[in-house]
């Protein structure tokens, strides 16, 4: 081809090419074009002859201003029409009088301002007809009843103002999945405007001026539809009443969208009418006072987003929106439950009384103060079974003893992002008999015992990075009652003494990460008593990171036992020379990363065994000795590997000796060099 | 199952050491710590101190630091507790024992070795 | 070292009478507290650990209670067989000390 289309799999990619013609030289049996972001001012039928297999013609983003209706008589199995982002204007009956396969009708923004009379009459078989976009004033889109099969009609970012029965009745036979009105200025609902459209599932005003009174209107209106999904999102909506919604009592309504409305006072029973309702957003109001009613009727809700629902209006404590105790008790079906990014003053005795089925529920970032967590801080939880808490980010200082007591199948808690400086006694996790993930990390300072986790020995996953802790070094270890954990993070803790049993009977091990800390006596062979064999037994070990241990000696039999190991992280330590065979049993290694030592020589004798099954290898910034006993064998290696080795050609150099310096490892010629085959 | 089995009777004289040997089968015997602790004919129990069979690192109650020697033997999976300088009152059935998934318990424990110290 | 004084010492209740014992530790051992009953010529037997979580096979009517220092262990209706000698231990730190026991007698 002539042109620098691609062409895959039958689909060409002639996008952004600068094109004034379509290109007359692509394989006949394509059923993919995209000819989008070019200068294309025309579709002449003529060039698409060839082209007789088209199922979908993208020309989106050219400057096409009209359609010759033959277009679509060369292309007769056509079934997407993207033609976004033109000129075009003016759509007439013969427009896409042939396109009578068309599934997909993308014309947004586009100048069309006006549909006379019918031009999509034609498509029987159109499920999707974008006019978003437009200067569309109104919904009309024809003068007789058509689209049947139609299920998405993309109407936003027009200038419709009114919706009218005798416009909206060309769908008395169409089942609309969505109609997307958002963006629209429109002042007025005309009695039975829902009513000409055979079925309706989804409508989606967002970015529409309702307020308050319009929405109890549009409700009126929905009255005895098909309606399913609301979205109102940022339709001011700043109050809410028991009369609001009524009209949706006589409907089925399962999602129902209300986020970014600045909604301030949600009054009692504004939902009551709302009883099948399944999926509601709240996020990003301003409630200020949730009453014991507020929710009330909701009994069929299971998913419920308030994130950013809640927020003060001044630094005044006076001014924190409250929450009644027993409001949510209505909501008996609520399983997702998300309160994130608030300003709740704290957690009152029956906060959550009444969420009999709830599994998961996050407030990260909730509470004003929320310090400590004591034995009766989510008591109203008792009777909820659930699975996910995130308590991240609350400035949370303390865990008393029995905090968790409650949350008998609690099986993942997230702690991370907190304040948390105490010694853990384990009686803070009491009652956690199903837990399985207990996260930790950031948080000030968290001393361990013997026994701080004896009472959580479900236990899989322990997150403790960058928590200063303490006492890691006591023996027996306090991860010993921990023997189902597969995943250990004590990274970032500047941990400079551990014992050799600080990880014993950790048998199930598969992920530890122990990066940034200060490990690197314990490996010297100087050490008192010897190098400190912390890895020994852990035979399903993965994945190991010890980056950034300050390590300049590796104990030969330190990975002895990882015969599963598959990715170790050595990278950013001061590692010069490593002993024969360190790596002999790690036949399973993919991934190696020694970048930022101080590596000089890379012998087969030491990373042979190493480099067997390597997929990926990093060993970039190290001061490499250009030398035959040092590099060749490497060198002949990489020239020859499959394994991936990224920056290979700028950040392998040579440091010495001095006439190398700063040459590339991989171009070390080594055909002088005896004896140094990287495979025999 | 888990079984603690531990070395017959002894009897021995005031001055004299005594060895219990406790040997573990049912489960990786270097994974547990095994405890000692003691019970004099008619009183409580005592506890007299832990051993990693993994690495031998022991902690003694220091009330029997001074005379008490804990070892093990991986080989044949076999914990040991030596009592030295007896005395008439260290005359007591020594029991070996193990915590279980729950490391705040012992479970398991052996069938207990009387010693008697008596002149 | 945290002591552990256990009351009564020796006691006598008629079958099927409730009885209570009790243990208090001088120091806060939080939960870490475990009951055995040991027959005469046996090896202690593991009832309640963690201060309230029976051990498998004891049966019901033995239960446990407390947290911190003051710890109860209740059989609810004594039977023939729970004549025993009856030890609580603390697990919070060494030395892990036994109470001095309680000596169950049927009247």
């Known amino acids: 081809s002539t042109t620098k289309c691609t062409v895959s799999h039958e689909v060409a990619d002639c996008s952004h090419l600068k094109l004034t013609q379509v290109p007359d030289d692509l394989p006949t049996n394509i059923t993919v074009l995209n000819l989008t972001h070019n200068q294309l001012r025309r579709l002449p039928a003529a060039n698409f002859t060839r082209y007789s297999q088209l199922t979908s013609l993208d020309v989106g983003f050219n400057t096409i201003s009209k359609l010759e209706p033959e277009l679509c008589q060369k292309l007769p199995m056509l079934k997407v029409l993207n033609l976004q982002h033109n000129e075009l204007s003016q759509l007439s009956d013969k427009t896409f009088a042939f396109c009578t396969n068309l599934t997909e009708l993308h014309l947004m923004s586009n100048s069309i301002q006006k549909i006379k009379n019918n031009p999509f009459v034609k498509q029987k078989n159109l499920i999707t007809l974008d006019l978003s976009h437009n200067g569309l004033s109104s919904t009309k889109l024809g003068t007789q009843v058509q689209l049947e099969n139609l299920q998405e009609l993309l109407l936003s970012n027009n200038k419709i103002q009114a919706l009218k029965s005798e416009e909206l009745d060309i769908f008395a036979n169409s089942s609309l999945k969505k109609l997307e009105l958002s963006s629209n200025q429109i002042k007025e609902f005309s009695p039975g405007c829902f009513h000409a459209i055979g079925r309706l599932f989804g409508l989606f005003l967002n970015n529409v001026q309702l307020g308050p009174s319009l929405t109890e209107k549009l409700c009126l209106e929905l009255a005895n539809t098909s309606i399913r999904n609301l979205s109102l999102s940022n339709s001011q909506l700043s109050t809410t009443s028991n009369t609001t919604f009524l009209g949706l009592k006589w409907t089925n309504l399962t999602m129902l969208d209300l986020s970014y409305n600045n909604l301030n006072v949600v009054g009692n029973d504004s939902f009551a009418w709302l009883p099948q309702l399944e999926y509601f957003f709240l996020e990003y109001n301003n409630i200020q006072h949730l009453f014991s009613h507020s929710l009330h009727g909701l009994f069929n809700v299971r998913y419920l987003n308030l994130k950013r629902s809640f927020t003060k209006q001044s630094i005044s404590l006076a001014s924190l929106p409250k929450i009644d105790d027993f409001s949510f008790q209505w909501l008996k079906c609520l399983e997702h439950l998300n309160m994130e990014d608030n300003d709740i003053p704290g957690i009152k005795s029956n906060m959550f009384t009444g969420l009999i089925n709830l599994k998961y529920l996050s407030l990260s970032n909730s509470f004003t103060s929320l310090r400590t967590l004591t034995n009766e801080t989510f008591v109203s939880l008792a009777h909820s079974p659930l699975h996910i808490l995130n308590l991240t980010k609350n400035k949370i200082s303390k865990i008393e003893s029995d905090a968790f007591s409650w949350l008998g199948h609690l099986e993942v808690l997230d702690l991370g992002l907190n304040e948390i400086g105490q010694e853990l006694t384990g009686q803070e996790w009491r009652g956690l008999e199903n837990i399985f993930e207990i996260y930790l990390s950031y948080n000030k300072y968290l001393q361990l015992t013997r026994n701080s986790f004896a009472l959580v020995p479900s236990l899989q996953r322990l997150m403790l990075r960058r928590v200063a802790l303490k006492n890691v070094d006591s023996s027996p270890s306090p991860f010993q009652p921990l023997r189902n954990l597969t995943i250990l993070d004590l990274s970032n803790n500047n941990i400079a003494n551990i014992n050799d049993d600080m990880l014993e009977g950790l048998e199930k091990l598969e992920i530890l990460d122990l990066q940034h800390n200060n490990l690197a006596r314990l490996w010297k062979h100087a050490n008192p008593g010897g190098p400190i064999y912390f890895l020994k037994g852990l035979s399903h070990l993965h994945i190991l990171n010890l980056e950034s241990n300050g390590f300049d000696e590796i104990p030969v039999e330190v990975f002895k036992d990882l015969f599963e190991l598959k990715i170790i992280d050595l990278g950013l330590n001061n590692l010069n020379t490593l002993p024969a065979s360190v790596f002999n049993n790690q036949v399973s290694l993919k991934s190696l990363n020694l970048q930022k030592n101080l590596i000089t020589s890379v012998e087969k004798k030491v990373f042979g065994p190493a480099f067997r099954n390597l997929t990926e290898l990093d060993m970039r910034f190290n001061p490499f000795d250009c030398t035959c006993e040092s590099i060749a064998w490497f060198v002949n290696w990489i020239n020859e590997t499959h394994t991936n080795i990224p920056e290979l050609s700028s950040h392998y150099l040579c440091n010495t000796p001095p006439h190398y310096h700063g040459f590339p490892v991989r171009l070390f010629d080594t055909s002088s060099c005896k004896d140094s085959a990287p495979f025999e | 199952q888990v079984q603690l089995v531990q070395s017959g009777a002894e009897v021995k004289k005031p001055g004299a050491s005594v060895k219990v040997s406790c040997k573990a089968s049912?489960?990786?015997?270097?994974?547990?710590?095994i405890h000692w602790v003691r019970q004099a004919p008619g009183q409580g129990l005592e506890w007299m101190g832990e051993i990693n069979p993994n690495n031998g690192r022991i902690n003694y109650n220091e009330k029997f630091k001074t005379r008490v020697t804990m070892t093990r033997d991986t080989s044949i999976s076999t914990a040991y507790m030596e009592l030295s300088r007896l005395r008439s009152d260290d005359t007591a059935v020594y029991y070996c024992?193990?915590?279980?998934?729950?490391?705040?318990?012992?479970?398991?424990w052996g069938q207990g070795t009387l010693v008697t110290v008596s002149s | 070292d945290i002591q552990m004084t256990q009351s009564p010492s020796s006691l006598s209740a008629s079958v099927g009478d409730r009885v209570t014992i009790t243990c208090r530790a001088s120091?806060?051992?939080?939960?870490?507290l475990a009951w055995y009953q040991q027959k005469p010529g046996k090896v202690p037997k593991l009832l309640i650990y963690?201060?309230?979580t029976l051990a498998d096979g004891v049966p019901s009517r033995f239960s446990g209670s407390g947290s911190g220092t003051d710890f109860t262990l209740t059989i609810s209706s004594l039977q023939p067989e729970d004549v025993a000698t009856y030890y609580c231990?603390?697990?919070?730190?060494?030395?892990?000390?036994f109470g001095g026991g309680t000596k169950v007698e049927i009247k």
């Open positions: 963690n201060a309230k």
């Open positions: 120091g806060n051992i939080h939960n870490y």
């Open positions: 231990q603390h697990f919070w730190s060494t030395p892990f000390t």
């Open positions: 024992a193990r915590v279980g998934v729950m490391i705040t318990t012992f479970p398991y």
């Open positions: 049912g489960y990786t015997f270097t994974t547990y710590w």
